[in-house]
């Protein structure tokens, strides 16, 4: 993050930045940016084969819970969005798109029917789903 | 907002990045940004007027709706929260902290029971609702 | 004027089926979750069903579970009740009710608009 | 289930009387609990809700009380007009009402 500060006194702008604000990203043109990660929710519907598939042209994955203090805004996200957990039915762990197992206590994972994909829900609720199912999604970014 | 790539060549970083990508902000450490306007939702339950000193107390105000498009995060917000629209009883009209009049069309307004104040929920609804009510609370800072 | 307007009660045999509706006017339908509540002859008001403002999300009595449907058509500011396999405890005058029950909501404000009842009676 | 009962079941009280109806949960409920008046052959009307508040409309003589377990609802002086059956009804955590007996008030 450039802090806003620095930014200011190296530009010296007239407006004034308090030394609480601070800017946040980089990230894509008309994202969210929260705690330094970019988010999109996408409203058209996929499976979450395209749904990876579209986060992946944007230079971003599904979503990837990793911390309930660092991505707690998606406490109130409302509706069922796919995210980059899936179900690896050799040893039936649930791991994220680059290989890492999903924590425990993270996520509640609760079965809606039988799938190795899974949905994100407000308050840190895992959706078991049908990969196939079409869903909205969310895409994230990880800021460098 | 500092184009990614002016701070990059700036700063002669190592690390390249592309055009399409921006900093936002500067909003208060912590904050969503997006589109350029800062966010925070609080969890503690308030009613209008501490909701409304709170988010002065931090250089903000409460939620204003102006624009479906700039601020369509918004759809997805779960719950309901205070936001900064007020009834004036002497006109009949609904307007922000700022004194302008609530846009026609921007919100569906839904009476939930008697009040003055009004709540926030998903997809551009307002609950009226009694303005001692404890609830959530949006905090919002548009900046320069 | 807000009002509600329930029809299609009626005589029916036990194991048969109706269908009730109400129609809206006076408020935003679409706004409002909806709600029947039935009382039986000389009997005290019992819920039966509540539908979302969405429709999303329906409720129901376990009395009536799997027998009875709330729908919603809000193009036609109408609600439905389709009751299925009816039993003579059925037997009741039917409500229709506005519903300030607001999905995730802390506080309930009650049942502010009632219907005048349509009456069902089940007897063979 | 959270059963709701209502005492007392009949009250004959004259006009001008206070009277007070009390219902009682089994066991501990938020304030989301509601008042109908019903009089013979009309639909219930609500009177009170979020146990306190007076609905629009309604006369000031009405109002309501209470907390945990067990609440009221008054008529500070009784009219002609109020002369009905009165319901409290509670909503449960997800959305299933119950409605108490009923308390039918006469004319003595």
């Known amino acids: 993050i450039w802090s806003a500060v620095f930014l200011n006194s190296l530009f010296n702008q007239e407006v004034q930045i308090p030394l609480t604000e601070s800017y946040c990203g980089p990230c894509p043109k008309n994202w969210i940016c929260y705690k330094n990660n970019c988010y999109q929710f996408f409203n058209e519907s996929k499976n979450w084969y395209e749904s990876q598939a579209s986060c992946m042209s944007q230079n971003a994955s599904l979503l990837k819970v990793y911390s309930k203090e660092d991505q707690d805004l998606l406490k109130l996200v409302k509706s069922y969005h796919w995210m980059g957990l899936v179900h690896i039915p050799t040893n039936g762990s649930w791991q994220w798109e680059d290989g890492s197992i999903l924590s425990p206590n993270l996520l509640t994972i609760i079965e809606m029917q039988k799938g190795d994909c899974a949905l994100y829900a407000s308050s840190f609720k895992g959706y078991i789903e049908n990969c196939s199912i079409p869903n909205t999604y969310i895409c994230m970014q990880r800021t460098v | 907002i500092w184009s990614a790539v002016f701070l990059n060549s700036l700063f002669n970083q190592e690390v390249q990045i592309p055009l399409t990508e921006s900093y936002c902000g500067p909003c208060p450490k912590n904050w969503i940004c997006y589109k350029n306007n800062c966010y925070q939702f609080f969890n503690e339950s308030k009613n209008w007027y501490e909701s409304q000193a709170s988010c002065m107390s931090q250089n903000a105000s409460l939620l204003k709706v102006y624009s479906k498009e700039d601020q369509d995060l918004l759809k997805l917000v779960k719950s309901y929260h205070w936001m900064g629209l007020v009834h004036i009883p002497t006109n009949g009209s609904w307007q922000w902290e700022d004194g302008s009049i609530l846009s026609p069309n921007l919100l569906t307004i839904i009476e939930m029971q008697k009040g003055d104040c009004a709540l926030y929920a998903s997809s551009f609804k307002g609950y009226i609702e009694n303005c001692s009510i404890p609830n959530t609370y949006i905090c919002m800072q548009r900046t320069v | 004027e807000v009002q509600l307007l329930e029809s299609g009660g009626g005589l029916v045999q036990p194991g048969g089926s109706l269908r009730l509706s109400c129609t809206a006017s006076?408020?935003?339908?679409?706004?409002?979750?909806m709600s029947w509540v039935r009382q039986a002859p000389g009997k005290g008001l019992e819920w039966v069903s509540l539908?979302?403002?969405?429709?999303?999300?329906?409720y129901y009595a376990d009395s009536v579970k799997g027998r009875f449907t709330n729908s919603r058509d809000d193009s036609r500011n109408t609600l439905y009740l389709q009751m299925n396999s009816l039993r003579a405890e059925d037997t009741a005058v039917y409500y229709c009710?506005?519903?300030?029950?607001?999905?995730?909501?802390?506080?309930?404000?009650?049942?502010?608009?009632w219907g005048q009842g349509t009456t069902v009676t089940v007897s063979s | 289930d959270i059963q709701l009962t209502q005492s007392p079941s009949f009250l004959s009280a004259f006009v001008g009387d206070r009277v007070t109806i009390t219902c009682r949960a089994s066991?501990?409920?938020?304030?989301?609990l509601a008042w109908y008046q019903q009089k013979p052959g009309k639909a219930p009307k609500l009177l009170v809700y979020a146990t306190s508040t007076l609905q629009s409309g309604v006369p000031s003589r009405f109002s309501g009380s209470g907390s945990g377990t067990e609440f009221t609802l008054t008529v500070s002086s009784l009219q002609p007009e109020d002369f009905a059956t009165y319901y409290c009804?509670?909503?449960?955590?997800?959305?299933?009402?119950?409605f108490g007996p009923g308390t039918k008030v006469d004319i003595k």
């Open positions: 006076g408020f935003t339908f679409s706004s409002y979750a």
């Open positions: 009710a506005k519903d300030r029950w607001f999905e995730g909501y802390h506080s309930y404000y009650g049942m502010d608009v």
């Open positions: 009804q509670q909503l449960k955590s997800y959305p299933s009402f119950t």
């Open positions: 066991q501990g409920i938020s304030n989301n």
């Open positions: 539908i979302s403002e969405s429709g999303s999300s329906t």
